[in-house]
Interface confidence: low
């Protein structure tokens, strides 16, 4: 028997520095977690103690903090090289700055293979990107070889900016021939490493003949056997065992997100490459693990540019940006409109001639807007200003919801109106009229939404049975502020870009902004 240790991360999202327990900015260092310096300490400890170790990343290193905003992926290549990652799969967020934003900072600089079997380049891009990412890679480990085959969510064109010269194929269809190829090369230990979410990870384990282990990402799935060490609630045991169609037990793993845990899986193979046993657990990277001093020093050196950036002007406002709780928790506020407009703008994807865009709607809890911005400071808007407005380090995500769920959400928005509570919704691509004289749960008297399948966008009444795409904060997607109906009834959820980054990019693009209060949210009394 031959034993392999797989160390894995996924959805790190730019958390190069240690973070608080909820993966936001570290405040009290003695209680902070994660970060590449601490990760390196643990990885090195395991490499010294165990003979056959692979360090793998399942995608979405890009996007999430000011580190990515400033360094645009160069930080990912630099620190992953420093940690000596063995392989990485491409995630959807690796395309956030277009294909060029992937090729130059990461693909050309990485000293480890970057993988995806289901992304096919065409046209002029094919020769430019050739060899920079691979469908699979055979890695020598000790006196054996291990095949790693990569995959990426086929929804990436809707979630990021891969352009028109990359085709995202069905994962299972694309993986099978690559695994078959590995078998012909006498590689009998094969890991599928990818970024399509836990449901697809399980399907790959079940359907792709020859895959021995699946290491996944995208769904931020936390798996754990036994008593979990922090706040995350396990979605199943670690590893999660799937019996494949050909009767093999295939371990599937994921390691939550944000570099908070290091996935640790021990696999025992027989001489024919069959998995005999698998066990392990994610390791919580808490303050009991010291930060490696050399990596920490490097982080501090790179940090200087970030501090300079946060006070630089992104753009100007010529109007007061009203982000006060007195406005945003009671009525339409222009800060809410600005943020929602930025959220939609960030999701412009012309993937189908029938649609001007795939999504037109935004909702945003008023309680998530934490500060106004005064235009009387020469109109200057900085990253620092935006961090006061959006201090929680969230993301703006894409969900699919039925009209009936949206209606419930808007009823919840005003079910206890007048108490300055955070659930009052700010909107984009939506016109809502409330009648507060009616009883809670029956206060929405008009709800019109902007069409997507149209050449001239216009507002139509919400249809209860129709499925709509909506951009919203991850906080709402997870049922925050009492929006349990969203969490319980959403049909799809894909995590998006860092909230501040979305707004800062929009302001930089527009240069001068002047959002108005324009009748997106109205109140009426009497008949309709």
């Amino acid at each position: 028997a031959w034993e392999l240790t797989i160390l894995h991360t996924n959805d790190v999202h730019s958390r190069l520095e240690q973070t608080s327990e909820d993966s936001s900015k570290c405040v009290n260092a003695s209680r902070c977690m994660g970060g590449v310096a601490r990760l390196f300490t643990k990885v090195q400890q395991i490499r010294r103690a165990e003979p056959n170790v692979l360090l793998l990343d399942a995608g979405d290193q890009y996007q999430g903090t000011i580190w990515f905003t400033v360094y645009k992926g160069a930080e990912v290549a630099h620190f992953m090289n420093a940690l000596r990652y063995d392989a990485m799969a491409l995630g959807n967020h690796e395309f956030d700055n277009g294909v060029e934003g992937l090729i130059e900072p990461l693909l050309k600089e990485a000293k480890f293979p970057i993988l995806s079997a289901n992304i096919k380049a065409k046209g002029p891009l094919a020769s430019q990107i050739s060899g920079l990412y691979l469908p699979y890679k055979v890695l020598p480990v000790g006196d054996e070889v291990v095949g790693i085959v990569g995959y990426t969510s086929k929804e990436t064109p809707f979630l990021s900016n891969p352009g028109t010269n990359l085709v995202f194929e069905d994962e299972i269809t694309a993986l099978q021939p690559e695994v078959d190829k590995l078998k012909t090369l006498n590689v009998n230990k094969i890991i599928a490493l990818g970024h399509s979410g836990f449901e697809m990870d399980k399907l790959i384990a079940q359907k792709v003949r020859g895959v021995d282990v699946v290491v996944g990402g995208h769904s931020n799935t936390f798996l754990y056997t036994g008593n979990p060490p922090s706040k995350e609630v396990p979605a199943g045991k670690y590893p999660f065992i799937v019996t494949s169609d050909d009767g093999r037990k295939v371990p599937v793993v994921q390691a939550y997100a944000f570099g908070k845990y290091l996935g640790y899986l021990k696999i025992e193979f027989d001489e024919r490459g069959n998995v005999i046993s698998s066990h392990g657990n994610p390791i919580l990277l808490n303050s009991s693990i010291p930060e490696d001093p050399s990596i920490k020093a490097d982080i501090n050196k790179w940090r200087i540019k970030l501090d300079n950036y946060s006070t630089q002007e992104l753009g100007k406002t010529i109007v007061y940006l009203d982000g006060s709780s007195q406005s945003c928790r009671f009525r339409e506020c222009n800060m809410g409109n600005l943020i929602c407009d930025a959220m939609i703008n960030n999701n412009l994807r012309h993937t189908d001639e029938m649609f001007w865009n795939h999504v037109s709607m935004c909702i945003l809890n008023g309680g998530g807007i934490r500060s106004p911005i005064d235009e009387r400071n020469n109109g200057t808007i900085t990253w620092e200003n935006l961090a006061a407005v959006l201090p929680f380090g969230g993301t703006f995500d894409l969900v699919q919801l039925k009209g009936s769920t949206l209606k419930k959400a808007f009823e919840h928005s005003v079910h206890r109106y007048g108490q300055s509570t955070g659930e009052f919704l700010q909107v984009g691509g939506i016109h809502v009229v409330y009648d507060l004289s009616r009883k809670p749960g029956d206060r929405v008297v008009k709800l019109d939404v902007l069409c997507t399948k149209c050449r001239v966008p216009s507002y139509d009444p919400l249809k209860m049975d129709e499925v709509y795409k909506v951009i919203l904060p991850n906080f709402l997607a997870n049922g925050g502020d009492g929006f349990q109906m969203i969490k319980d009834e959403l049909l799809r959820h894909d995590s998006g870009d860092q909230d501040i980054n979305v707004v800062s990019t929009y302001i930089s693009k527009m240069k001068v902004i002047y959002p108005a209060v324009e009748g997106r949210i109205k109140f009426s009394t009497g008949s309709h």
Epitope: I241, T243, G247
Partner: antibody, heavy 120, light 107 residues
Framework: QVQLQQSGAELVRPGTSVKVSCKAS????????IEWIKQRPGQGLEWIGL????????NYIEKFKGKATLTADKSSSTAYMQLSSLTSEDSAVYFC?????????????WGQGTTLTVSS | DIQMTQSPASLAASVGETVTITCRAS??????LAWYQQKQGKSPQLLIY???TLEDGVPSRFSGSGSGTQYSMKINSMQPEDTATYFC?????????FGAGTKLELK
């Protein structure tokens, strides 16, 4: 159509061994797991273990390790369960079942059962 | 090992009546639950898998639901041919374990 045909009833003495067979037909034998289940008269069902006919790999519940031995013959598409050191506690109906190939892995086809009576 | 607690142990129902059988797992089994029907002197037959997916050929009066540790199977109009013993089984973890069974008789 898929069928699992088990060997006939057995009456055996305590301390001896018995080998029960389960012949599969109507599907690719090596693509599915064969599971074995025990049912004592008027009792519930108790999982014994499984065999992967493709690889020969087995998995037993702790209490049946040393009691049951699972094997498979690919050429005849037959799975076998040998029970050793028999006592009256082993008197039961034994079923083989095929584990389905969809996610969740239920037992989609069962043999008709083999009745084992251990008596002196 | 994961324990499966099935209830009731037995019940009698009239034709057309709705019958509900429940199964509680000792820990979360993440929908990995199947229901089987066993008629007198016969081998069990698969009715429902993945907690709520009806096996091909099973009458639509049978349905399954549940999540986490709590699951149930419903027969929404009892028929004479439904007289049998019903077992739940978790397939989330090895060893696979069955409920003790519910004997359903015609009233």
């Amino acid at each position: 159509q898929v069928q699992l045909q088990q060997s006939g009833a057995e009456l055996v003495r305590p301390g001896t061994s018995v080998k029960v067979s389960c012949k599969a037909s109507g599907y690719a034998f090596t693509n599915y797991l064969i599971e074995w289940i025990k049912q004592r008269p008027g009792q519930g069902l108790e999982w014994i273990g499984l065999i992967n006919p493709g690889s020969g790999g087995t998995n037993y519940i702790e209490k049946f390790k040393g009691k049951a031995t699972l094997t498979a013959d690919k050429s005849s598409s037959t799975a076998y369960m040998q029970l050793s050191s028999l006592t009256s506690e082993d008197s039961a109906v034994y079923f083989c079942a095929r584990r389905g190939d969809y996610y969740g892995n239920p037992f989609d086809y069962w043999g008709q059962g083999t009745t084992l009576t251990v008596s002196s | 090992d994961i324990q499966m607690t099935q209830s009731p142990a037995s019940l009698a129902a009239s034709v057309g009546e709705t019958v509900t059988i429940t199964c509680r797992a000792s820990e979360n089994i993440y929908y990995s639950l199947a229901w089987y029907q066993q008629k007198q002197g016969k081998s069990p037959q698969l009715l429902i898998y993945n907690a709520d997916t009806l096996e091909d050929g099973v009458p639509s009066r049978f349905s399954g639901s549940g999540s986490g540790t709590q699951y149930s199977m419903k027969i929404n109009s009892m028929q004479p041919e439904d007289t049998a013993t019903y077992f739940c089984k978790q397939a989330y973890d090895v060893p696979l374990t069955f409920g003790a069974g519910t004997k359903l008789e015609l009233k």
